[in-house]
């Protein structure tokens, strides 16, 4: 790797901050000596900070040590201290703080609502297809197919609870065995981690922020993928999850419990049900091969219905088809029997936007998908902005220390386990791991939480979502209680097994290292993030699905060589880094391969060319659209008027004299001032919480 360039006369900073294994964070450096990373990850340089306009300090800063891109940034407090304010200033500051809090809660509310609507949109677009995945009979015999169906269905409906409830209803109807359901549950666990990865993509505007956010989100993905990689073969060989859960279910005489409390839904439902309401039973019916359900719409039209049970006379082909011998008769031509029918009378229509449009599900889904992504992105940008202006100076130090500091020796190891419990508890409160991990993602991005701390929180979230499922199972009706409880317990023990594999020993925390690696790649080549998402959540599962349909022989024929090549590459990589001398000179590095096989640079050129045509077109688009543009084309020039990428361009072009770009100022007022928008004296109005 090339040495990191330093300024000529600069003396290196004597204090060297290293990130501890347990995620202990360095103390914030002196504000006057603040350093910031450049957005170019290839050659990180020491930055020169433009100091506040009221400071007389020199522009050339003493450079610090080589900056670790994973060190948390210190959010600089440039406001006037509380003690220095007059009464008017203090009152103004107080109300500003209250205003910010209200705004933050408001955006957070709409953020969660948009996640809910995003899930509904995905169900409208792909729900029926998802249901049809389940009706494939090969699931019973092929655990790999079950796994990818679990992934695909959960990705398509954006809800692991939906896919899990389909599995439960199929098991209780004897359409699926618990053994066949376990790989689907594992797949659902993987699929649910796509949501926070999508949320992380929204933070693409700032490279360093994106690096952390994307790594923080994908740590969940890697944990799930690695757990499945190890535990699926173990389960297929030993059926340990099935056996343990069966013993538990049989040893307890469970009575039907109460429904799992809907804590967050109580707040979000009043809003989301005004947008759209879905009849989720349709997906389950399709999964259970109900032909009539295929023509039903997922959009709920009638919310108030009257169900009347009545007996009607129906003709049957022969007396053998009669309900019972005593309920069988003839009119001389046809055989008749009496059938119990449930007559549903529609009373009141639902009160949502799409109730009277009678649009096809795909159209409604597409509209909602676009709108929810825009709202999600907009809310996320605003949350990050507000947090960025609130979490500064002492506030940031207190929060970061509280969240990221370990317990004193010898109890430091307990901190992570407490974080797991916190993650589980929070997920139980919000009733959704997607919501919890998605809310965590921007906090990782702006540097409030380290990846080392986010990891146990995410693992806890995985546990929390299963406790919700266990409660829901205990509330299910008699016939479904046993199967739903066993499946919920399988889910629980799968996550516990995963934690035991990838958490207790710091050395085994592979998901952190893999997520950081992916974060670095994605910060450098931002299109790779989308590529990763498509490959891992769509292409690989779809390929395995296709090959599985073709039969075991095809799957093995293609799979074995692929797995062999992957293992070969990994072994070679390991030898190259640990003991390269044992390898022949040619194999000591990857230079023997063509450039396109060992570097993303040529691919980057291809992607840049491919997206080049879009660069001018999104010029006068809104900020949200621009973020999407930046993500796809990695082009700072494409969004001049919205200014969302322009700053990145300036940061990249000005690397020789690294001056902090206006938008990256921690203080909004100062950034405006630097652009000549606000007079210097106005900076006094800026206020921070402490």
């Amino acid at each position: 790797m090339a040495p990191w360039p330093e300024l000529g006369d600069a003396q290196p900073n004597p204090d060297k901050y290293l990130e501890g294994a347990a995620g202990q964070q360095p103390t914030a450096p002196d504000k006057s000596k603040e350093t910031n990373k450049t957005d170019n990850t290839e050659a990180p340089v020491t930055k020169i900070e433009l100091l506040p306009s009221y400071s007389t300090a020199t522009l050339i800063d003493e450079p610090t040590e080589v900056d670790d891109p994973w060190n948390l940034p210190t959010l600089q407090d440039s406001g006037i201290k509380w003690s220095e304010r007059d009464t008017k200033g203090k009152i103004l500051c107080f109300f500003q703080g209250i205003g910010r809090l209200i705004l933050l809660l408001g955006f957070l509310y709409f953020f969660v609502c948009s996640l809910d609507i995003l899930s509904s949109a995905f169900q409208l677009v792909g729900g029926k297809m998802a249901g049809q995945f389940f009706s494939n009979s090969s699931i019973m015999s092929n655990p790999l197919l079950g796994l990818v169906i679990g992934v695909l269905v959960t990705v398509l409906v954006q809800s692991s609870s939906t896919s899990t409830s389909i599995v439960v209803s199929m098991v209780s109807s004897s359409l699926l065995t618990v053994r066949a359901a376990i790989p689907i549950i594992m797949g659902a666990n993987i699929g649910t981690s796509i949501t926070n990865t999508i949320v992380a993509l929204m933070q693409v505007g700032d490279r360093s922020e994106f690096r952390r956010a994307f790594a923080g989100a994908t740590v969940h993905d890697f944990f799930n993928w690695l757990s499945v990689l190890v535990l699926l073969p173990v389960e297929v060989a030993t059926h340990y999850l099935e056996i343990i859960t069966q013993l538990i279910v049989e040893s307890f005489h469970f009575k039907n419990g109460e429904d799992a409390p809907d804590l967050l839904k109580v707040i979000t439902k009043p809003f989301t049900k005004l947008i759209v309401q879905l009849d989720k039973k349709v997906i389950s019916q399709i999964a259970m091969n109900d032909e009539k359900a295929k023509n039903k719409s997922l959009v709920k039209i009638w919310c108030k219905t009257f169900t009347n049970k009545t007996q009607i006379n129906v003709t049957v082909p022969s007396t053998a088809n009669c309900t019972s011998p005593s309920l069988c008769w003839t009119d001389g031509i046809q055989n008749w029997t009496m059938k119990n029918v449930t007559y549903k009378e529609n009373i009141a229509k639902c009160q949502h936007i799409f109730v009277n449009f009678h649009l096809p599900d795909l159209a409604v889904g597409t509209i909602l998908l676009i709108l929810s992504l825009l709202v999600l992105c907009g809310c996320l940008i605003m949350i990050v902005k507000i947090l960025g202006s609130v979490l500064k100076g002492q506030v940031a130090t207190v929060i970061k220390k509280t969240i990221n500091t370990d317990f004193p020796f010898p109890f430091a190891w307990l901190t992570g386990y407490l974080a797991i419990l916190v993650g589980a508890g929070m997920t139980f409160i919000v009733q959704s791991s997607s919501v919890f991990t998605s809310a965590l993602t921007p906090l990782i991005g702006i540097g409030v939480i380290t990846i080392e701390r986010a990891y146990p929180l995410t693992l806890g979230s995985n546990i929390g979502t299963t406790t919700t499922a266990i409660l829901a199972a205990l509330a299910s009706p008699g016939n479904a209680l046993r199967s739903s409880l066993q499946i919920a317990l399988c889910h629980f023990f799968f996550n516990i097994s995963g934690i035991l594999l990838w958490y207790p020993i710091p050395f085994t925390r592979l998901p952190i290292r893999m997520a950081k690696g992916l974060g670095n790649i994605s910060a450098k080549y931002r299109w790779f993030a989308v590529f990763y998402l498509i490959i891992f959540f769509f292409l690989i599962p779809l390929t395995v699905f296709g090959l599985s349909l073709a039969g075991w022989r095809v799957l093995v024929g293609v799979g074995v060589p692929v797995v062999f090549i992957i293992i070969l590459v990994l072994c070679l990589r390991l030898l190259q880094s640990r003991c390269p001398r044992v390898l022949p000179k040619k194999l000591q590095n990857w230079n023997f391969l063509p450039l396109w096989m060992r570097s993303l640079k040529p691919w980057d050129a291809v992607v840049s060319k491919f997206t080049g045509c879009f660069q001018m077109r999104c010029c006068c688009c809104c900020r949200v659209c621009c973020r999407a543009c930046c993500l796809l084309c990695d082009c700072p020039k494409c969004c001049r008027c919205s200014k969302c990428c322009e700053d990145l361009e300036e940061a990249q072009e000005g690397q020789d004299v690294p001056v902090k770009a206006p938008e990256t100022f921690d203080n909004i007022t100062i950034s405006r001032e630097a652009q000549g928008e606000v007079p210097a004296s106005d900076s006094k109005t800026e206020c921070t919480a402490l």
Partner: antibody, heavy 120, light 107 residues
């Protein structure tokens, strides 16, 4: 009111065929099943079969299948029964009847009967 | 085929008496049983269907009961105009079958 008017008595030779009619009035002909019942002197009643005039669907007692043919003429609202290969035991009164009690085989309107005598 | 065995084959009783006629099916017919009255030289007349439902215009002295294989027709108070042959019929399975009939006379 509902009326079922059957054709007059027949005297036929063994091995011959007989076709009797049942002209209906007072209801929509195609609505109800038309049943045919045999009542031999001093013996019980036997159900021969039924026809649904609306579609022409028929159903027969296995004992009479192949020998009895039920037809219906919607234009004249008349039902017919043809009995072939007659034997002396076919001597009986044949009734046409309808069931207006939907979906049941309980017949509530009967014709006056057609007497068939099989004699050489 | 389902056999319908009717008993008695004939009975003689006085006006005002209670008359009970039974019908036994060879297999379960549920409640798909009808009762008919046939006077000499006339066509049969439907009295009861679905075991116990009186047809329109049938006096309430006629009642029916039973289910499965055993069925009963009761004439609560015999009247002179009730002199006729009574027979049961099952319509549970094709072919429809009839009972042999019970001839009711007045002493």
């Amino acid at each position: 009111q509902v009326q079922l008017q059957q054709s007059g008595a027949e005297v036929v030779k063994p091995g011959a065929s007989v076709k009797m009619s049942c002209k209906t009035s007072g209801y929509t002909f195609i609505t109800y099943n038309m049943h045919w019942v045999k009542q031999a002197p001093g013996q019980g009643r036997e159900w021969i079969g039924a026809i649904y005039p609306g579609s022409g669907d028929t159903s027969y007692n296995q004992k009479f299948k192949g020998r009895a043919t039920l037809t219906a003429d919607k234009s004249t609202s008349t039902a017919y029964m043809e009995l072939s290969s007659l034997r002396s035991e076919d001597t009986a009164v044949y009734y046409c009847s309808i069931s207006t009690i939907i979906t049941t085989g309980a017949v509530d309107y009967w014709g006056q009967g057609t007497s068939v005598t099989v004699s050489s | 085929d389902i056999q319908m065995t009717q008993s008695p084959s004939s009975l003689s009783t006085s006006v005002g008496d209670r008359v009970t006629i039974t019908c036994k099916a060879s297999q379960d017919v549920g409640t798909a049983v009808a009762w008919y009255q046939q006077k000499p030289g006339q066509s049969p007349k439907l009295l009861i269907y679905w075991t116990s439902t009186r047809h329109t215009g049938v006096p309430d002295r006629f009642s029916g009961s039973g289910s499965g294989t055993d069925f009963t027709l009761i004439i609560r108070s015999l009247q002179p105009e009730d002199v006729a042959t009574y027979f049961c019929q099952q319509y549970s399975r094709i072919p429809l079958t009839f009972g042999g009939g019970t001839k009711v006379e007045i002493k």
